[in-house]
Amino acid sequence: ELCDDDPPKITHATFKAVAYKEGTMLNCECKRGFRRIKSGSPYMLCTGNSSHSSWDNQCQCTSSAARNTTKQVTPQPEEQKERKTTEMQSQMQLADQVSLPGHCREPPPWENEATERIYHFVVGQTVYYQCVQGYRALHRGPAESVCKMTHGKTRWTQPQLICTGETEPSQFPGEEEPQASPDGLPESETSR
C-alpha cells in the first residue's frame, strides 16, 4: 500500500530514508536536456525476499538532442552499497537500521539524473530527520516519521524534533547538531 502524502516538513530540518521498504518506487527522472532511454523503465522498484532486497530496473538517461547515443547505466546498487558498507563499517552510526531485511539501500547516482528524486513510499516506511546547518535539536522523542495505515487511510507520524535558532559557536561550543556528533566536537559549516 502506497503512502498518500509526503512525510511532514519540520522547520530547519531535513529528512532521509536510510533504507527503503520493498514495494517502494523511485521515478527515473532525468535533468533538463536529457531523457529516459526509450526502452528504459519509468521507475525502479525495491523487490526481494526476506533475506535479500534490491532495486529492479535501472534508471538510464541519454541526451535529448542525440540519437542512438551510449546508454548511461546505474552502477549495481547492491554491489556499490555492499562495498560502501564494508569500507565504512567502523564509522556507521546507523548500521542496524541500514541492514534491515526487506529493505533496499539508496540507489547510487546515475548519470544526468534529475536534481530531485521522487520516491513513492509504502506503509511502514520510516524517514529520519536532522537539523540543518546552524540549528540545533531539541528532542521530545524520536526524530523520525513512520507511514502508518489507520482506518483505511495512510498518514505519517509527527517527528518529535524541534530545530532551534542559529547558535553562536563562541557562545555554545559543541552544541551545533548535538544529536548526531559522534566525535562530540563542533565542526565548521557555512552557507554561501
Epitope: T14, P109, C131
Partner: nanobody, 130 residues
Framework: QLQLVESGGGLVQAGGSLRLSCAAS????????IGWFRQAPGKEREGVSY????????YYINSVKGRFTISSDNAKSTVYLQMNTLKPEDTAVYYC???????????????????????WGKGTQVTVSS
C-alpha cells in the same frame, strides 16, 4: 558508469600546499553533497569537508579549519580541495565521496560524519614530510 576520479595528491613538505580535484562527469551536482574523506594508516576514515551542490553550504572538520578550502565548478562537474599550511598529520589517502541531499535539497553534517556515502572514489595519496 558514473565514477569519481581524484587527482592532485603527492609528496609535499610541511607548510606547503596541494590542490586536490575530484571529477564526477555526469553527476547532477545540485542533488548531492560532494567532498572529501581521508584515512591515515591505522586510523578510521574521517570526513574532512563537503560542499552542497544545491546552495554551496560548506563543512570542515575542526583540524583543517582555516587551512583547507573546498570549492566546486558545477559546469566542469569537479570539486576542489585547496590544502594550505599542510602538516605531517594531514598525511593520508584522500577519498572523494558523494551523498544524496535530504528533503528540500538540504543536508545535515551528521550524515557526512556517519561516513555512509552513496559513491566513493578510489583515493589519492597525500604525504606531508617534516
Amino acid at each position: 558508469q558514473l565514477q569519481l576520479v581524484e587527482s592532485g595528491g603527492g609528496l609535499v613538505q610541511a607548510g606547503g600546499s596541494l590542490r586536490l580535484s575530484c571529477a564526477a562527469s555526469g553527476l547532477t551536482f545540485e542533488g548531492y553533497a560532494i567532498g572529501w574523506f581521508r584515512q591515515a594508516p591505522g586510523k578510521e576514515r574521517e570526513g574532512v569537508s563537503y560542499i552542497t551542490g544545491s546552495d554551496g553550504t560548506t563543512y570542515y572538520i575542526n583540524s583543517v579549519k582555516g587551512r583547507f578550502t573546498i570549492s566546486s565548478d558545477n559546469a566542469k562537474s569537479t570539486v576542489y580541495l585547496q590544502m594550505n599550511t599542510l602538516k605531517p598529520e594531514d598525511t593520508a589517502v584522500y577519498y572523494c565521496a558523494v551523498d544524496r541531499l535530504g528533503s528540500q535539497g538540504r543536508y545535515a553534517s551528521a550524515w557526512w560524519r556517519s561516513g555512509d556515502m552513496d559513491l566513493w572514489g578510489k583515493g589519492t595519496q597525500v604525504t606531508v614530510s617534516s
